[in-house]
Every structure is written in C-alpha cells, then in structure tokens.
C-alpha cells in the first residue's frame, strides 16, 4: 500500500497579511456575565437576544428578544433591579473616550410593551437605574433628572447645567479623561435613597478650538473647555440629594476637607459605604497629597457630617499619590474599616487594612511585587489581583485572602489553572462573590470560565475561542518571548516578537514599539494578533517592547524615577535596550526603527532625536510634543507646574521642538488626526513648524476629522498601509 507523503506542517501554513489585521480576522471574544443576583446573570447572545441564566437551577431563557431590541435599533440594555423594566439604548453617538449620548426607551417586561407617556428626552448624556426598585436618574443638557417610576413625570434636580460651562452628574473633558475614567459623575446609595453627584464649573477654563471639516461649505469649530498645564482648572462641588423627597430639602453640599480646600484641588472618587455613609476622595492640585473623607447622614438636622477624625491622608514623598489614579477603598462588612492599595515602606503598592488611622494600617500583602486591584471583599474573603507569581511583572493572577483566619491565609486562584495558556486574568464577581467569572487574556487564546466562589471549582467554560483557534491553525504566527535584561542596577522587562522561521545566526531588522508613559505597562502576557504580529509574521521584522523607568508595577523607585523629568529616562532606557538587542547578534544595526502612539509618539520622537545614530527611521502617531500643551491633571501629576518657581525649565527642555536639529539624520514620519480632542493637532503642528524652521526634511500625514484613535475604518486602513510602506522602504523590504 502506498505510503503517505509527509508534509512538514510549516509548509502548509501561511503568513499573516495586512488585510487579516485590518479586517479583524483574528479578533478574540471574551464573556463577562451581567450579574443581577448572587447566582443569576444576563448575557447578550450572538443573535442579540438578552438571555437570563440561573447557575443553580441551570435554567436559561430569553428575557428580551432580538426583535424587541431591533424594533428601536437598540445596541445595549439595562435591567431594573426589580426586574420590571429594561432600558434600551440606541442612536449611540460617541463624544470623548468614555462619554456618548444615546436615545433611551423603557420596555415594561410585565405587559410586554414600551412605556408611553413622559418619554425620556433625547439625546441623553447618561442614564442609570437605582440599585433597588426602578427609579431612574438621567442627565440631559448637563442637568440631572429623577423619575420615581419609568412612567412618572421627571423631577429636575439641578438647574445650573449649561453647555461647556457647568456639568452636573457628568464629568467635563479633563475629569473624564484624567481623573474619573467614566462617563458619569453620579452615584446611588445602596438602598436608592440618596443620589450623590458632582457639579463641574468650567466657566473660567480656557477653550481649545479646532476645525471639524465635515462636508459643508464651511468647517465648524469644536470648542472644549480644556485646562492645559498651569491653566485654570474646573471648580468641583459634590452634592447629595434625598431622592425620596427631592423637593423637600434640595441637594446638600458635601464639604471639602480643610487641608485640601486651602489651595486648588480635585475630587477623585466617591464610594457609598452604606445607605447613610459615603466616602469621598480628594486630591491637592500638586498631586502628592490625597485625603479620604468618610461622611455620615444625621437624621436630626438632615445633614452630612464629615468629622476630622474620619479623614485619612495618603502622601507620597517620592512622587505622586497613587499609581495612575489614587486607589479606591474596599470597605468591610462593618462599614467602618476598609482595605486599600498604597505604597508600603519599601515603595511597593500593597493592600493595607485601615481600621482607625492610616498610621495604624495593617499591611496585608508584601513583597517585591505589587497588588494591583481589589475585586471584592466579603465576610470571609478578599479577592485581588497581583503580579507576584514567578516574578513576572506583566502577569496578572487572582488571589483570595481568607480574612476570617488569623493570620489571614492566601491562595492563588488562577496560577495553575491553565498555566501555559493563561497568565493574565481579570475577574467579574456576582453579589457577595458566590460565583465569579474569570477572563484570561493570554498569552494563549483568551478563555472565559465560570467558577464557584466558595470552592473556586470551574463550573463551565463560557467562551474558549474555538473558531479562532481553528482559523489560526494554518497561520504562521511569530514566536513571543518575555524576558528581562540588566543594565547597571536596573532591570528592564521586554517582549520580543520573532519571525516564524527565526534563526539566531541571521540578521533581522528591528522595530521598537514604545508607549512608556508613567504607570503604563507594555510588556504583558496577553494574546494579540495585530499590526506588529503581521510585521513579524509576513515581513520578517523582529519587534521589541521594553518597559523602562516610569512604567508600572515594579515599585516606586522604578515608577517615580521619571517624576518631574519626563522625556529623559523613558528614552534613555529604550536606547539601552536597543544596544543590548544589538549585542544579541541577530539584529541588523543598519535597520532599526522605532514607533509609538500618543505618549509613545513623544518617546519615539525623542529617541529618534537622541543623536545616537541607533535608528534609521521612525514613526510618531499623535505625539505629545510639549507637556505645556497637554491636560493639567496629567502633565502636572508627573511634571509639577510650568512656572518659574516650579518646573518651567524642564517643561521647556523636554519638548520635541527643542530637538528639531537632531532629526536631520533620520527618516521621520509624523502622523496626527486633525480632530484630536486629547492630544491636540497643535502638538504635531509645532513639531512640523520647528522642523521646517530647522530646514529638516520629514514625512507627514494628517487624518482629517479623526480623533486620537484614528478609528474610522477607512482611516485605519490608510494609516497602517501608509506606515507599512514607510517601514518597508526604510528596511529595504520588497513589496
């Protein structure tokens, strides 16, 4: 009988194409249950039905059909806690990173029809159910409204709202992007009695104005109150209104702690502790002092009390308070003590237990690694994530601490579940953590699973990306390595993406992808098939990502190294890494490039202009070019103020423009969207002007009416095609 001809698997596989990336052919799915009780959740199915699941009875049924969704073109939904109503969201219209407006319809599940009468106005800026029953709070034209029931007339809570001037219940631009990272600034108390909200007064903030070309005869001008470094900031006030009788008392203002109110300050977050206790966090404009203030409702005077002995101060002596943001407290069942992540005496972020004062805090975790997020505190357990396991900063595992035990015992829930496939997890917990979902992002194919909150046993696989696994079978994927390199007393973690038939004895072009912003992390054990995967797979380019000083989760000494001197060590460490990669022997020294977006565009620009001759070419997409052009909250957190008596000198020294002459010996591609609300086009305009003034040749591309993400399909295609051509030309790779 004839023997079968053996074909090595490698020959049957194809390389990735740019088209694969642009079409999202190899995108993965995750599954996050929308928890509605201890053992029940909702999920939107592939065909857009909203399905109810009960883990214990194993029942599942369609709670809202796709035809009902389709009848109002709904793309999202929200079930009221009493399960009588669902809001349907349609006409989604993106504003900034988190914010959008939409049209909302209320569907009555009992009688199977939409609620008529007192329909909601449109477009609404934010809408949410109360945590109990079916009260609705929403923001329309910068004012907050309340409905006791969906069919009731609305009660207007605030009257001060004014476009681009005063925002109630929603953040202004800078708070949305740099402080809250949400589209909302209102919070219901757990029993739905009180509603807390923030008023942002932007009346004195300078306006950034840019053209939006559209397709009309005249462009329109977008105006955004946007405080750049050193400018006037929003004035914030926090109010609480009793929603049972909102007309009787009116919103009450919550006082700012005196030590904060004595100079410019920020509100940073609000956490309801119980139905009559609330916790507010405040931050000085010089962001090294944060105050957590616990306030109680007093029935006798119907007033909010924030006693001084319930103020807890967190201060950094080596940099700024917190990580990227100041952490939020996770309160115990006693509604008095809480768990919080902040730096320990060795400068590593760890979980601390605060009972009375921060000085008497009990450290719960410790070591030369960092606790990253507290997911849930229950009667007997605390669930958190960290990068402790095996000493890899770019991993995330979920741990459980049994707080009932003395001393508390720690268990890694995820470390050994699917060790090769999964090293980077997040979690989603049901009420009281009776059940939880784990979502693994890599390094292998992402997988989502359901677990018992008592035993940690896996109950069910929710999504394992089987289709993706099958479609990747015939693809030549690059090899990914995560390792560390040492230089002097410093350790830098890097990720290297190697072409499929990588041979150490050969020479390859190298592309450095950089972000490098303070408290960011690029070297993560996650799965991705993206542009750089394609460059390695098809074009034979070695890609490297390096986490230099200023990046996160490796202690404050490493993190705070960049404090008040952005643009120095981030660049230096990329250069150090490139030299180390050259020493490895497989890099073609004549073909090294660097690229980055946003903060990465800033670092790539400075690296190209470092005068080292290491780079042949590079790309900066939407780069910051001067910290004076960027948002106050961000710039000042890391750089202080651009004033003579503070840090003006380094603000001036750290610009890309100051290094214009040094671009003469590199090929530079500068790219920016003209409607970038975040890193304004101004940044690239100033780089271009400085290069022209210095008579330095460079390439540039703008994307009309595109924002910081350059997200429109056509623009993305053009952008990545353009960058690919540029790189291939730089590396002398044939088309």
């Amino acid at each position: 009988r004839p023997s079968r001809v053996y074909k090595p698997e490698g020959n049957t596989k194809r390389a990735l194409t740019l088209k694969d990336i642009l079409n999202g052919t190899f995108s993965y799915k995750t599954y996050f249950p929308n928890w509605i009780s201890e053992q029940e959740y909702l999920h939107q199915s592939e065909d857009d039905n909203i399905v109810f699941y009960n883990i214990e009875t194993r029942e599942s049924y369609i709670i809202l059909s796709n035809s009902t969704m389709k009848s109002v073109n709904a793309t999202d939904y929200g079930l009221s806690p009493d399960r009588q109503f669902v809001y349907l969201e349609s006409d989604y219209s993106k504003l900034w990173r988190y914010s959008y407006t939409a049209t909302y319809y209320i569907y009555d599940l009992q009688n199977g029809e939409f609620v008529r009468g007192y329909e909601l106005p449109r477009p609404i800026q934010y809408l949410c159910w109360s945590p109990v029953g079916s009260k609705l709070a929403y923001v329309y034209q910068n004012n907050i409204y309340l409905k006791q029931r969906p069919g009731d007339p609305p009660f207007q809570i605030t009257y001060t709202g004014r476009e681009n001037r005063i925002f109630n219940g929603i953040p202004d631009w800078v708070y949305e992007e740099e402080m809250l990272a949400t589209k909302y600034a209102l919070w219901w108390s757990p029993d739905g009695k009180f509603l807390a909200y923030v008023e942002f007064n932007d009346s004195d903030i300078p306006i950034i104005a840019y053209s939006y070309y559209g397709d009309g005869q005249y462009p329109r001008t977008i105006n955004i109150p946007y405080p750049k470094a050193g400018a006037k900031n929003p004035v914030v006030r926090v109010f609480i209104v009793d929603t049972t009788y909102p007309h009787h008392v009116g919103p009450m203002e919550v006082p700012v702690p005196e030590m904060i109110a004595s100079s410019d300050y920020y509100f940073s977050w609000l956490t309801w502790v119980s139905s009559e206790r609330v916790c507010l966090q405040w931050l000085k404009r010089v962001q090294n002092v944060s105050v957590l203030s616990i306030c109680d409702f007093r029935e006798d005077w119907h007033a909010w009390e924030c006693p001084k002995n319930q103020e807890h101060v967190e201060e950094s002596r080596t940099g700024w308070a917190g990580g990227f943001f100041v952490s939020t407290p996770a309160f115990s069942q006693d509604a008095t003590s809480y768990y919080k992540i902040f730096s320990d005496k060795d400068g590593y972020k760890h979980i601390h237990y605060i009972k009375d004062t921060v000085e008497n805090a009990i450290q719960i975790t410790s070591g030369k690694w960092e606790a990253i997020y507290i997911f849930r505190v229950t009667q007997d357990s605390l669930f958190y994530s960290s990068n402790e396991f095996e000493g890899y900063p770019g991993r995330r595992n979920i741990y459980r601490i049994s707080i009932g035990n003395s001393p508390p015992s720690k268990k890694c829930v995820t470390c050994h579940l699917r060790k090769e496939r999964c090293q980077y997890y997040t979690a989603s917990f049901s009420y009281k953590a009776k059940y939880y979902a784990l979502v693994c992002y890599g390094p292998g194919l992402p997988i989502s699973t359901l677990h018992d909150g008592r035993t940690d046993q896996e109950i069910q696989v929710l999504e394992e990306n089987k289709e993706l696994e099958n479609s990747l079978r015939n693809i030549q994927l690059p090899k990914v390595e995560i390792k560390k390199l040492k230089d002097g007393g410093l350790t830098f973690w890097y990720k290297m993406i190697l072409p499929p038939q990588f041979d150490r004895s050969k020479k390859y072009p190298l592309l450095i992808q950089v972000y490098g912003g303070p408290c960011s992390q690029s070297v993560k054990s996650v799965f991705a098939v993206n542009w750089i995967t394609y460059l390695a797979s098809k074009e034979g380019i070695v890609i490297a990502l390096v986490d230099g000083r200023g990046t996160a989760f490796q202690g404050d000494k490493f993190l705070h190294a960049v404090y008040r001197k952005l643009g120095v060590y981030e660049v230096e460490d990329q250069l150090t890494a490139v030299r180390k990669f050259i020493e490895m022997g497989f890099i073609d020294e004549e073909r090294i490039a660097i690229w980055g977006w946003s903060y990465g565009g800033y670092v790539s620009s400075l690296a190209l202009a470092s005068g080292t001759g290491l780079f042949k070419c590079g790309i900066a997409v939407a780069p910051v070019s001067s910290w004076e052009y960027y948002a106050s909250i961000y710039s000042e957190r890391f750089m202080g103020l651009p004033t003579k008596d503070d840090n003006l000198e380094h603000y001036k020294n750290s610009t890309v423009m100051a290094r214009a002459e040094y671009f003469r010996n590199v090929d530079y591609l500068l790219i920016h969207g003209t409607a970038d609300d975040n890193v304004h086009f101004q940044n690239s305009a100033q780089i271009a002007k400085a290069l022209v003034n210095a008579q330095v040749d460079f390439q540039a591309m703008w994307y009309s009416d595109q924002n910081h993400g350059i997200l429109s399909g056509r623009s993305q295609n053009h952008l990545y095609t353009h960058m690919t051509h540029f790189l291939k030309q730089c590396f002398s790779l044939s088309d």
């Epitope: 009116g250 919103p251 009450m252 203002e253 005077w301 007033a303 006693p307």
Partner: nanobody, 121 residues
Framework: EVQLVESGGGLVQPGGSLRLSCAAS??????????IGWVRRAPGKEEELVAR????????RYADSVKGRFTISCDTSKNTAYLQMNSLRAEDTAVYYC????????????WGQGTTVTVSS
C-alpha cells in the same frame, strides 16, 4: 471665637409675621461645612428644630409644624441667616435660638443667646 447674635423677636398677633436675624462671626456661613438652624424652646414642650439651611447649596429643611409658613434664608455677604415667620399661631410662642453646626465637628453646636417670640391677641 464663634458668636451668633439673634434679633427680631417680639410680640405679634395671630396671623402676623416676624423676621428673625442671626448674625454670625468667627466662621463663614457660606462654607459647605456649615449648617445654620433655628431651634425653639417653649415651656412644657420638647425642643424643636424648626428650620435649617446650608447656605452654600441653599438646601433647606423644615419641621412639619411650620412648613409653608416659615422660610429660612441667608445673606452670605452679611454672614447672616434669617427666619421669616408668617401666619403665626399661638403655639409658635417660644424662645428662638440660632444654632450653628460644622460638618467637621458635627457633635458640637454653637448657640446664640435666644430671642423671644410671643404670639398673642
């Protein structure tokens, strides 16, 4: 030193009106940490907080017994709070005290010396 000084009390017929004033010194009534209240004491009756205001927000609260008849307000430029009393009844007769409470030190109440209101025909 914090001081609250009331004025405006007196004798008035049922159905009449009076306006009580409370001038504050030693703290700022427009601070969000400050609440000003009017408390009345009458022989044989329990002390009653008839109205309170947080001047920073304008949030007010009234005892059911005076709702719709009394209005509490403040003039932050004068650092003074007022109680406008309309449709007065015999049962409104009492000594009216201005009280100040600060959120940071809630348990402590600053008191004025009191002003007497007598409603009688």
């Amino acid at each position: 030193e914090v001081q609250l000084v009331e004025s405006g009390g007196g004798l008035v017929q049922p159905g009449g009106s009076l306006r009580l004033s409370c001038a504050a010194s030693g703290f700022n009534i427009k601070d969000s940490s400050t609440y000003i209240g009017w408390v009345r004491r009458a022989p044989g009756k329990e002390e009653e907080l008839v109205a309170r205001i947080q001047c920073s927000s304008g949030s007010t609260r009234y005892a059911d017994s005076v709702k719709g008849r009394f209005t509490i307000s403040c003039d932050t430029s004068k650092n003074t709070a007022y109680l406008q009393m309309n449709s007065l009844r015999a049962e409104d007769t009492a000594v009216y005290y201005c009280a100040g409470r600060q959120s940071y030190n809630y348990g402590y109440i600053y008191w004025g010396q009191g002003t007497t209101v007598t409603v009688s025909s």
